[in-house]
Interface confidence: low
């Protein structure tokens, strides 16, 4: 048992022309977090099924708002390490998805949005306790650094995490720098010493003194690149040193087979062996499958098993995206009529109507004077989703059932009197005016 | 929105050839384009795909029978098809692989391709 650890140190856009922009923005800030998906990189069989070995979800990273007219930074990160727990042995190859997902922190109803921004995948050759092991992925125009490493839990000790050690009852029978080991009780094991220089990134060991390399390393202490390595190749000038041929500039230099892939040299250039999973000249576009569980959020997968086929996402109501990663705002589209309020629940759609209107979508107009009585004589008058009522003389109110105090208003002008009259009112206009309301 | 549109199908004779053509629009950073086929009651299957790169690669049954092109410039796929047999019956889907991270996935309408013996 153990536990393989993810930490990222950057993302954001890669080098050269065509970077992307911030994928948030002042208007939508937004916050990045990441998961990992790890599958046993040489068993044929769990290569069919889904983060076989575990996958992980990091915490939300800050939020983070564009500066307008500022370039694209690397972008602020989560929080801590992704933490894969591994039950069984350790397996040495491995292949991994990391995917960047974009949170839209938006006033958006139904909560935020997620998207993918990018995905990167590998093959990798990784023995349990050794150092950490550094990476650089670029997804597009994206650029994502990391690194990672396996190591055992207590008491399982070993490049596999097999072997299992427990404390003694007596440690100090041991010499210094001597850790306690089972199987026998009183045995001490010294901890496990590579050959003096074997490269701590691309070499390990399973026996003390020994080098053994990664993947696309070579030499006694695994520091020469394979593609690299003299004698290897008859192209070039001759070392004065080894009297081998060093190679010169050769198609497979640097490797440029992406993912793990192997390079071989054809007469016309070269030829990329790719990993499964994997496809492209130089295995740089990854074939992912249903398999792993790429449609989020019950999003029903469709496509052939086999790394070589694509895959589409059926989505479920609410969602969109080829990942079904994001969330449809329904609201947007402005379902509710007659300026009903609309509430996106997620699994349905709710319209919170205005006075006056009703129905699913608020589209139902109703009769604001239907069942309503204006008293005393007054109309009811429709309109705007609510009744109102035009009273009669004398009378006022919602209903017209509050007899009016014509007077109240002080309706005569320039100091004339008023007198309440069964007809209306009555002004006597002081000397010099005159008309109904002592206007003139 | 991206859309293909499959054409060339039909009945042939065992032993006969035809040649579908996928035209693809709508669509930025394009990955790969492919033809996949699903015989009836069978499932989908990929036959053949080639990468923007020109890379190719096909299905076992198919090698050496069929061949995949494509014509960058107007944005097709050709898929020639030689020695049918009637185990090549079927839907035939064009599907297009688009995006700066090579994971959204497009699929054709498919188009009938008829082998009798």
């Known amino acids: 048992a153990g536990v393989f650890e993810l930490q990222i140190h950057s993302f954001g856009p890669g080098p050269g022309p065509g970077a992307p922009r911030s994928p948030c923005s002042a208007r939508l800030p937004c916050r990045l977090f990441f998961r990992v998906c790890l599958k046993p990189g040489l068993s044929e069989e769990a290569a069919e099924s889904p983060c076989a070995l575990g996958a992980a979800l990091s915490a939300r990273g800050p939020v983070y708002t564009e500066q307008p007219g500022a370039p694209a930074p690397d972008l602020p990160l989560p929080d801590g390490l992704l933490q894969v727990p591994f039950r069984d042995a350790w397996p040495g190859t491995f292949s991994f998805i990391i995917e960047t997902w974009r949170e839209e922190l938006g006033d958006q109803i139904g909560g935020p949005a997620w998207s993918l921004l990018a995905r990167v995948a590998g093959r990798r050759r990784l023995a349990a306790g050794g150092p950490w092991a550094r990476d650089i992925q670029r997804a597009g125009a994206w650029e994502l650094r990391f690194s990672y490493r396996a190591r055992c839990e207590p008491p399982a000790v070993g490049t596999a995490c097999t072997r299992l050690c427990r404390p003694r009852s007596a440690p100090s029978r041991c010499g210094p720098g001597l850790r306690p080991c089972a199987p026998l009780e009183d045995e001490c094991e010294a901890p496990l010493v590579c050959r003096a220089g074997c490269s701590p990134e691309h070499g390990f060991c399973e026996q003390p003194g020994e080098c053994r390399c990664l993947e696309g390393w070579t030499g006694p202490l695994c520091t020469v690149p394979v593609s690299t390595s003299s004698c290897l190749s008859p192209r070039g000038p001759s070392s004065a040193t080894t009297g081998c041929l060093v190679p010169g500039p050769g198609p497979c230099d640097g490797n440029p087979c992406a993912n793990g892939g192997s390079c071989s040299e054809t007469p016309r250039s070269f030829e990329c062996t790719c990993p499964r999973g994997f496809y492209g000249l130089r295995c740089e576009v990854s074939g992912v499958t249903c398999a792993d569980g790429p449609c989020f959020n019950g999003g029903l997968c469709v496509g052939g098993a086999d790394p070589d086929s694509a895959y589409i996402c059926h989505c479920p109501p609410g969602f969109q995206g080829s990942n079904c990663e994001k969330r449809v705002d329904r609201c947007s589209l402005q379902p509710c009529r007659n300026g009903g309020l609309c509430l996106d629940l997620g699994h349905a759609l709710r319209c919170r109507c205005r006075a006056g209107f009703a129905g699913p979508r608020c589209e139902h107009d109703l009769d604001d004077c239907a069942g309503r009585a204006c008293a005393n004589g007054g109309t009811c008058v429709e309109g705007g989703g609510a009744h109102r009522c035009s009273c009669a003389l004398g009378f006022g109110g919602r209903d017209c059932r509050e007899r009016a105090d014509p007077c109240a208003a002080r309706p005569c002008a320039h100091g004339g009197r008023c007198y309440a009259h069964f007809s209306g009112l009555v002004c006597a206009c002081a000397p010099g005016y005159m008309g109904a309301r002592c206007e003139f | 929105q991206v859309q293909l549109v499959e054409s060339g199908g039909g009945s042939v004779q065992a032993g006969g050839s035809l040649r579908l053509s996928c035209a693809a629009s709508?669509?930025?950073?394009?990955?790969?384009m492919a033809w996949y086929r699903q015989a009836p009651g069978k499932e989908r299957e990929l036959v053949s795909r080639?990468?923007?790169?020109?890379?190719?690669n096909y299905a076992a049954s198919v090698k050496g029978r069929f061949t995949i092109s494509q014509d960058n410039a107007k944005n097709t796929v050709y898929l020639q098809m030689n020695s049918l047999n009637p185990g090549d019956t079927g839907m035939y889907y064009c599907a297009i692989i688009v995006g700066r991270t090579c994971s959204l996935n497009y699929w054709g309408n498919g188009i009938l391709v008829t082998v009798s013996s």
């Open positions: 080639i990468s923007t790169s020109g890379f190719t």
């Open positions: 709508g669509y930025t950073d394009r990955c790969s």
